[in-house]
Interface confidence: low
């Protein structure tokens, strides 16, 4: 490590013989110290222009001793100005002063880049008292220094209303380069021109940076930090990093991985969350993005079917959530679903087909040749009806589902009656009397209930008069 | 090289909200990929509680639907989640992921923040 | 939502023994995922898509099954392989893990 200590001028005479605490580290000379007799005078030489007299931060005391003895001013004395080390060095510095014994509890205080140093700092103030004056040394120990330990440091000690400060000791910390921008990954489009950027500071400067591509330098000749390296396009993926020099050495950047965007990967586990009898709900599991956000995606959906076309139905949709509810399909069908997604460079291939079925639908006819009577004997209502000629994508007949509305004097109610598909008749109830009943029937299948009839209505008289006039629906064609 | 990294108070008070952020690094947030939170309970039960992609779209669980929200500041390069209403049984360590991709599911974790929910 | 159970839930194994993990899953899978996790860390992604072997992960180690029945199985068991696995599906919504195994060494 580079150590250099540059010492002032020291016009005062050494105390004799090494003083208990004041260690120096090996790149700080003795400090300059009073006889244990005499006072500092006034008179003291700038650190920075030796021999020119300097009257800077002193205290002109003006109280007197009982002999009415003017006392001198006070002062610091002059140390070590700047010190040089490197990183993680132990640093021991001191300030120290000779104050006439009339003065009590002074006290000397550290202080960094005009911010005072308080708590875990290894500040240790020792006295050294004479007859008529004390010798204080202030030492400030720092462990394995840092850069951030960088700067001035200054004492300060207050007396009689007056602050005494002592002059700046200069730490300059010098350490390897340190990256204050280091190149980013990125993810480009091939033969595309990119910027990659790398700055390290110091101390010590200057600091020049290399670039390198996959382990190879890219340039012969150094540049200062900061550097911007332009690469003008790739065709494959590579690795860059930098290299940052210094006099104290070498430090590399981390290596950014620059990708050149491709068109994305197919999707995979498309799956189907649910089947109705015209849509199927499905998702899927993106592919690798080829390092370029997904934009959007393409459901595939082409029916199973020897006697279909073959043709495929696309639906767009937009690339998140991956979910897609396809509609408008088939009843009781067959499909064969895939799923391709695109990015800035194009589409995707499918992803593997999977197989989705339709559940079987709700009839689209209602029963036909519906009549109504009244079977007085009995107080019931007797309802005959055709089965509708149904679709194969309906699905299998399971019963029907007979609505009956009484309406009598602003009052109405409706019923609802469940009967097995075997039925093609069924008894209801008279409900109320001297009122209207009006009948409606629907097919029910698996995929649910299909359009009621056309309404047909009887008239339930009081008791002892029976209208036998029925309604009914005519089949088609038979009107 | 990718590192998540969760940070949130470790207490909150029951009734109150949950809100943790996840710093990534090593990938940006918008460039590809799943954002999302899982939690883990005392007994070590693990939770996908929901995620933000990369363009910004969310998918939450339905068990966690109508408290959670997972947001995101891309200039931070953070993503957030929100979990409001909170009661002891969100007790839990949080952690964030990356999920997606050729993997196709949490490739990268964060190391997790323990959230108590206590008065 | 589809839920995945673990057996055992607790084992022991010795030194060399051959080891197998199983996770069931309530309704069909496309792939399954598996994960360590060892105490006071984070889970690690160990086998993805069913049988793929994370970086880093060990060849004594492998994945199978298909639809409801998956397994995750070590050839031989050594010390540094004692930790809880948990299986993990994303074929459905929500996205659902196992309760665990812990693998415990004799």
């Known amino acids: 490590a580079i150590t250099e200590a540059r010492e002032e001028a020291k016009p005062y005479p050494l105390f004799p013989g090494p003083l208990p605490g004041s260690l120096q580290t090996d790149h700080t000379s003795l400090l300059s110290l009073p006889h244990t007799s005499g006072y500092q005078p006034a008179l003291m030489f700038s650190p920075t222009q030796p021999g020119r007299p300097y009257t800077g931060n002193v205290a002109i005391p003006r109280v007197t001793s009982a002999g009415s003895k003017l006392l001198p001013p006070l002062a610091f004395k002059h140390t070590v100005g700047h010190i040089i080390l490197s990183e993680h060095k132990d640093v021991k510095f001191n300030c120290s002063i000779s104050v006439p014994n009339i003065y009590q509890d002074t006290t000397i205080s550290w202080w960094k880049d005009g911010k005072e140093l308080l708590g875990a700092h290894h500040a240790i103030t020792q006295f050294y008292p004479d007859d008529e004056v004390t010798a204080i040394i202030a030492s400030f120990s720092i462990t394995s220094v840092q850069r951030s330990d960088n700067g001035s440091y200054i004492c300060k000690m207050k007396i009689n209303n007056e602050e005494i400060v002592s002059d700046p000791i200069y730490i300059e910390v010098q350490g390897l380069p340190h990256f204050t921008k280091q190149p980013e990954s990125m993810n480009v489009t091939r033969n595309t021109a990119f910027n990659l950027t790398c700055q390290a500071v110091g101390p010590p400067e200057p600091v020049n940076i290399f670039w390198v591509q996959n382990s190879s330098r890219v340039n012969e000749q150094p540049e200062k930090s900061p550097s911007v390296l332009t690469v003008p396009g790739l065709t494959e993926m590579a690795v860059f990093s930098c290299e940052a020099h210094n006099d104290k050495g070498l430090t590399v950047s981390k290596g950014v991985q620059i990708n050149i965007k491709a068109i994305p990967s197919p999707p995979t586990e498309v799956s189907i969350h649910n089947s109705t009898a015209h849509s199927i709900l499905i998702s899927w599991v993106p592919g690798f993005d080829g390092y370029s956000p997904f934009r959007n995606c393409s459901v595939q959906v082409k029916e199973v079917d020897p006697l279909s076309n073959g043709s495929v139905m696309i639906f767009n949709t937009s690339a998140s959530p991956h979910m897609y509810q396809i509609k408008q399909l088939q009843a009781l069908a067959n499909y064969s679903i895939g799923v391709s997604c695109m990015n800035e460079i194009g589409w995707s291939a499918v992803s593997p087909w999977i197989l989705a079925s339709t559940t079987e639908g709700a009839p689209s006819v209602a029963p036909l040749n519906v009549t109504v009577f009244l079977n007085e004997s009995r107080d019931n209502v007797d309802i005959r009806w055709m089965k509708p000629l149904t679709k194969r994508q309906a699905g299998e007949l399971v019963g029907y589902r007979i609505s009956h509305v009484w309406q009598s004097a602003g009052i109405s109610k409706e019923l609802l009656e469940e009967v097995g598909q075997n039925n093609s008749r069924a008894q209801i109830s008279v409900q109320v009397h001297n009122a209207t009943c009006t009948v409606r029937i629907a097919a029910v299948t698996k995929g649910g209930v299909g359009p009621f009839s056309d309404p047909v209505k009887i008239f339930i008289p009081a008791h002892g008069w029976v209208d036998h006039a029925p309604s009914s629906t005519p089949a088609p064609g038979n009107a | 090289d990718v590192q998540l990294q969760e940070s949130g108070p470790g207490l909150v008070k029951p009734s109150q909200s949950l809100s943790l952020t996840c710093s990534v690094t090593?990938?940006?947030?918008?460039?590809?990929?799943?954002w999302t939170w899982i939690r883990q309970f005392p007994g070590n039960k693990l939770e996908w509680m929901g995620y933000?992609?990369?363009?910004?779209?969310?998918n939450y669980n339905p068990s966690l639907k109508n408290r959670i929200s997972i947001t995101r500041d891309t200039s931070k390069n953070q993503f957030f989640l929100n979990l409001n209403s909170v009661t002891t049984e969100d007790t839990a360590t949080y952690y964030c992921?990356?999920?997606?991709?050729?993997?196709?599911?949490?490739?990268?974790w964060g190391q997790g923040t323990s959230v108590t929910v206590s008065s | 939502q589809i839920v995945l159970t673990q057996s055992p839930a607790i084992m022991s194994a010795s030194p060399g023994e051959k080891v197998t993990i199983t996770c069931r899953a309530s309704?069909?899978?496309?792939?399954m995922h598996w994960f360590q996790q060892k105490p006071g860390t984070s889970p690690k992604l160990w086998i993805y898509?069913?049988?793929n072997l994370a970086s880093g992960v060990p060849a004594r180690f492998s994945g199978s099954g298909s639809g409801t029945s998956y397994s995750l199985t070590i050839s031989r068991m050594e010390a540094e392989d004692a930790a809880t696995y948990y299986c993990?599906?994303?074929?459905?919504?929500?996205?659902?893990f196992g309760s665990g195994t812990k693998l415990e060494i004799k």
């Open positions: 933000i992609s990369y363009d910004g779209d969310n």
């Open positions: 898509t069913t049988s």
């Open positions: 993990q599906q994303r074929s459905s919504y929500p996205f659902t």
């Open positions: 309704s069909s899978v496309n792939y």
């Open positions: 090593g990938y940006s947030i918008t460039g590809g990929y799943y």
């Open positions: 992921a990356r999920e997606g991709g050729r993997l196709r599911t949490m490739d990268y």
